[in-house]
């Protein structure tokens, strides 16, 4: 596939990743399919500068990451090491709560409105973040 | 009311060791971020650490990385900074700091002062 | 690293002036710049964040502004207790770092 080089229209680039914020609520799986088929994966937090270019973006308002733990333990969509990297949980978070009476505990993580993280039942409707990385081959076939 | 009482400091040789602690009382400590911040005489403001509540991330400013160490215990509302291959530079007042949102700083001790000289 | 500059680097005012302190970014923090107040043999204080937002209890003389690389502290009507030294600081990314501050002293 053709390298990509530049943000599609309507995403924003920022240290060579490229994002598009959604203004509208998925559940995570549905959110996560979203990305996927833009080529791209729900956003990755690999720093302290990436967290805050993030929250600046989306505000005080939930919105799903690409972490979570539904096949056990905790991983992010495109296989960043969780243990070794960036966390950013509140305080007593995560706590995989089974006291919300929707069945399950919880299974996906998502900004808070102060920016950090709390894991909740994935079928929550909440905004979202998709990340591609620039120079990175694109899975579109080559013109011919 | 919300408190910080840094402690530790005092006059050490270069190339000895030293460890601050910092006492924090008022508030709920485990739930706060907190940092160390230094000032040399006469000069500004400089960072030196900041430790997440949870302990699950550390940043060192360049000029103490490898040679600091932050940390923390929340069963004593305790934060730490220890402090080894101490130079003359390092000598100032050491502050501890309650961070708000990733880097601000919304409350502060009193200082302690730490002196490196032979 | 991100330098951050201000300037001037002291200034002398009266009581009842409008003060003005300039912070510059080396490179695009958004709005991630706080700021300072200290006093002789003090600790710092926080009195603003997120370059505009008033830290409470801070009074609404202080103001803030600017985003990307280019901010400004004012205080509206200097009152006696505003003499200090005050310093921007930015948490956009590590390693921290704070302006080289600005002595605001009686004319």
């Known amino acids: 596939g053709s390298e990509r080089t530049c943000c599609p229209v309507n995403w924003v680039e920022h240290e060579r990743s490229c994002y598009w914020f959604s203004r509208s609520g998925k559940a995570w799986a549905d959110a996560d399919n979203y990305c996927r088929l833009e080529d791209a994966h729900l956003v990755v937090v690999t720093s302290w500068e990436e967290q805050k270019f993030v929250q600046r973006h989306i505000g005080p308002v939930n919105t799903w990451m690409g972490l979570h733990d539904q096949n056990g333990p905790w991983k992010w969509v495109d296989g960043t090491d969780y243990e070794t990297g960036f966390k950013n949980w509140r305080p007593e978070q995560p706590d995989d709560w089974y006291g919300h009476g929707l069945g399950g505990g919880e299974d996906c993580a998502h900004f808070t409105d102060d920016g950090r993280w709390n894991d909740d039942v994935c079928q929550r409707p909440y905004r979202w973040v998709c990340e591609t990385e620039l120079d990175k081959a694109s899975q579109e076939p080559p013109l011919l | 009311q919300v408190q910080l009482v840094e402690s530790g400091g005092g006059v050490v040789q270069p190339g000895r060791s030293l460890r601050l602690s910092c006492a924090a009382s008022?508030?709920?400590?485990?739930?706060?971020?907190m940092h160390w911040v230094r000032q040399a005489p006469g000069k500004g403001l400089e960072w030196v650490a900041i430790?997440?509540?949870?302990?699950?991330?550390?940043y060192y400013a360049d000029s103490v990385k490898g040679r600091f160490t932050i940390s923390r215990d929340n069963s004593n509302n305790t934060l730490y900074l220890q402090m080894s291959s101490l130079r003359a530079e390092d000598t100032a007042v050491y502050y501890c700091?309650?961070?708000?949102?990733?880097?601000?700083?919304?409350?502060w001790g009193q200082g302690t002062t730490v002196t490196v000289s032979s | 690293d991100i330098q951050m500059t201000q300037s001037p680097s002291s200034l002398s005012a009266s009581v009842g002036d409008r003060v003005t302190i300039a912070c510059r970014a080396s490179?695009?923090?958004?709005?991630?710049l706080n700021w300072y107040q200290q006093k002789p043999g003090k600790a710092p204080k926080f009195l603003i964040y997120?370059?505009?937002s008033l830290q409470s209890g801070v009074p609404s003389r202080f103001s803030g502004s600017g985003s990307g690389t280019d901010f400004t502290l004012t205080i509206s009507s200097l009152q006696p207790e505003d003499f200090a030294i005050y310093y921007c600081?930015?948490?956009?990314?590590?390693?921290?770092?704070f302006g080289g501050g600005t002595k605001v002293e009686i004319k």
């Open positions: 700091a309650r961070d708000l949102s990733m880097g601000g700083m919304d409350v």
């Open positions: 008022g508030f709920t400590f485990s739930s706060f971020g």
């Open positions: 430790i997440w509540h949870d302990g699950s991330n550390k």
């Open positions: 490179q695009n923090i958004i709005s991630y």
């Open positions: 997120t370059a505009s």
């Open positions: 600081q930015q948490t956009y990314s590590t390693p921290l770092t």
